[in-house]
């Protein structure tokens, strides 16, 4: 059983002799009727009228009336499309003079049921000037002096120089507030590789392959190790500044205390970690007497070494 077609709802148009025909609906597949389109609309064949067919899948064409959009005259733009007709669904590029463009940096307009979207017009847009670019040890080969918003330009570094990420060329982009960055061409010999490793410590960030001068990297020591020196290194003239040292802690073990018949004063730790410079207070175990000087019971940790007092 083939589904018949109900009365067609033709947006922006209608059937000829609509009121006479309405009582005879729904109609069988195969029937066709003449219809018209309103002003500013046309049939898919480009006429103001055509036939609409009842098919197994409903009315054909599905969109009987399509919007016509005529391309307007562009102030501050190239007018190769001026007066040309576009149909609903068609898009076209808008070519504006340098320094002008569509709003929101768009480049195309589309003919929609309601007309052009966005409206084809060329407004003053943000531009960047070549004269605002300072490039040392490199060059820009592009000939323009003014660049529109979002325009990317390439620059090249002279032999022996490279961009921050080690390449021989780079790019900058014209943004709302000017150029995205100034071109950087650094003497390859001034850059640094990854900073050096240190014993019992590590860097706090993901290390890169190449660092530009004045880059800083932070180090940290393993737990209980003490950082000596600056916790940052800086890249300068192709070399890193002196990295810090991680000084061994003193590990006070129950084994060593038992050997000397001593215990920690005021603590019951079986294992105790002390940093360089820390004072560790000991006392004799019950029933034992000091065999070393009273000062030795206030031992000082020196780079992992501690001298234990002794009790007999």
């Amino acid at each position: 059983q083939v589904k018949p077609c109900d009365f067609p709802d033709i947006k922006h148009g209608g059937l000829f002799h609509e009121n006479m025909r309405r009582p005879y609906f729904p109609v069988a597949v195969g029937k066709y009727y003449s219809y018209y389109c309103d002003e500013h609309f046309e049939t898919p064949s480009g006429s103001y009228w055509d036939y609409i067919h009842c098919t197994q899948n409903g009315w054909s064409p599905a969109v009987p009336c399509l919007r016509k959009c005529y391309f307007p005259y562009l102030e501050n733009g190239y007018n190769q499309n001026y007066g040309r007709k576009f149909v609903q669904g068609n898009s076209t590029e808008v070519a504006c003079h340098p320094g002008y463009g569509l709003p929101k940096a768009q480049t195309t307009v589309t003919c929609t049921e309601k007309g052009w979207s966005p409206t084809p017009r060329c407004i003053r847009v943000r531009t960047c000037s070549k004269s605002d670019i300072e490039i040392e040890n490199g060059f820009i080969s592009e000939s323009s002096s003014i660049y529109i918003l979002n325009k990317e330009i390439q620059y090249k570094c002279k032999p022996g120089y490279a961009t921050a990420d080690g390449n021989s060329s780079g790019s900058i982009t014209c943004l709302q507030n000017g150029w995205s960055a100034q071109p950087i061409c650094i003497n390859s010999s001034e850059k640094c590789g990854p900073p050096p490793p240190i014993s019992n410590g590590d860097t706090t960030s993901f290390l890169l392959k190449v660092y530009v001068p004045q880059s800083r990297v932070e180090y940290q020591c393993q737990p209980y190790y003490e950082l000596q020196g600056s916790n940052y290194v800086t890249c300068s003239n192709g070399e890193w500044s002196e990295p810090p040292r991680c000084i061994h802690p003193c590990i006070i073990t129950e084994e060593n205390m038992n050997k000397n018949n001593i215990k920690l004063k005021g603590r019951s730790d079986r294992k105790y970690y002390a940093k360089t410079g820390d004072t560790i207070e000991f006392m004799c175990k019950l029933g034992y007497n000091a065999n070393t000087s009273i000062l030795s019971f206030q031992a000082v940790c020196r780079e992992g070494i501690v001298e234990y007092p002794r009790c007999e």
Epitope: D165, G166, P194, P196, L208, K209, V210, Y211
Partner: antibody, heavy 121, light 106 residues
């Protein structure tokens, strides 16, 4: 053309140390590249373990850092991985890889063929 | 740690058709993203680096796009040798891989 070849024991006991070496041929380990270790558990995805530069600088996966030792031997043109206190979850194919020449950080363009390591008693 | 999420987990496509694989980063990785292809019993192979640059010897049917957190690998017309597992990897901050997308014959 640089080639990488992993070698090491295929079986390691639980709580033991997994030791692997990656031999670099057709190029120098002292080039401007990071030399990495990546593993793939059976039927699973890829996991980056860590990497070393010829100067001895390393990057390691934070969650594995305490168990991972990566070293480089420039005289033998090779780098090594030690993974301590292993358990069954460390059973995987272990790959060594090299990152691309170029920028500050790059993708892996050369891989070894991988070596299967099983952790079992 | 930056988490990379690939979708779909499995993609079934007929030879000659287009395949689109997605990869999302939990935070911006700029353009520091690579795509790898892995076939059973083989090591991964680099296809795309810098989000959109084809590696040496990779056919033009492979293309990458995106930046920041959203990336796409497109294979314009699938050949029989393209059916494999594909991984994305960020190398902006440490290095992490996505869980992979299996591309299978429909």
């Amino acid at each position: 053309q640089v080639q990488l070849q992993e070698s090491g024991p295929g079986l390691v006991k639980p709580s033991g140390t997994l030791s692997l070496t990656c031999a670099v041929s057709g190029g120098s380990i002292s080039s401007s590249n990071w030399w990495s270790w990546v593993r793939q558990s059976p039927g699973k995805g890829l996991e980056w373990i860590g990497e070393i530069y010829h100067t001895g600088s390393t990057n390691k996966k934070p969650s594995l850092k305490s168990r991972v030792i990566i070293s480089v031997d420039k005289s033998k043109n090779q780098f090594s991985l030690k993974l301590i206190s292993v358990n069954a979850a460390d059973t995987a194919i272990y790959y060594c890889a090299r990152d691309r020449e170029g920028g500050t950080t790059e993708a892996f363009d050369i891989w070894g063929q991988g070596t299967m390591v099983t952790v079992s008693s | 740690e930056i988490v990379m999420t690939q979708s779909p987990a499995t993609l079934s496509v007929s030879p000659g058709e287009r395949a689109t694989l997605s990869c999302r980063a939990s935070q911006s990785v700029s353009s520091n993203l690579a795509w790898y292809q892995q076939k059973p019993g083989q090591a991964p192979r680099l296809l795309i680096y810098g989000a959109s640059t084809r590696a040496t010897g990779i056919p033009v049917r492979f293309s990458g796009s995106g930046s920041g957190t959203q990336f796409t690998l497109t294979i314009s017309s699938l050949q029989s040798e393209d059916f494999a597992v594909y991984y994305c990897q960020q190398y902006d901050n440490w290095r992490t891989f996505g869980q992979g997308t299996r591309l299978e014959i429909k």
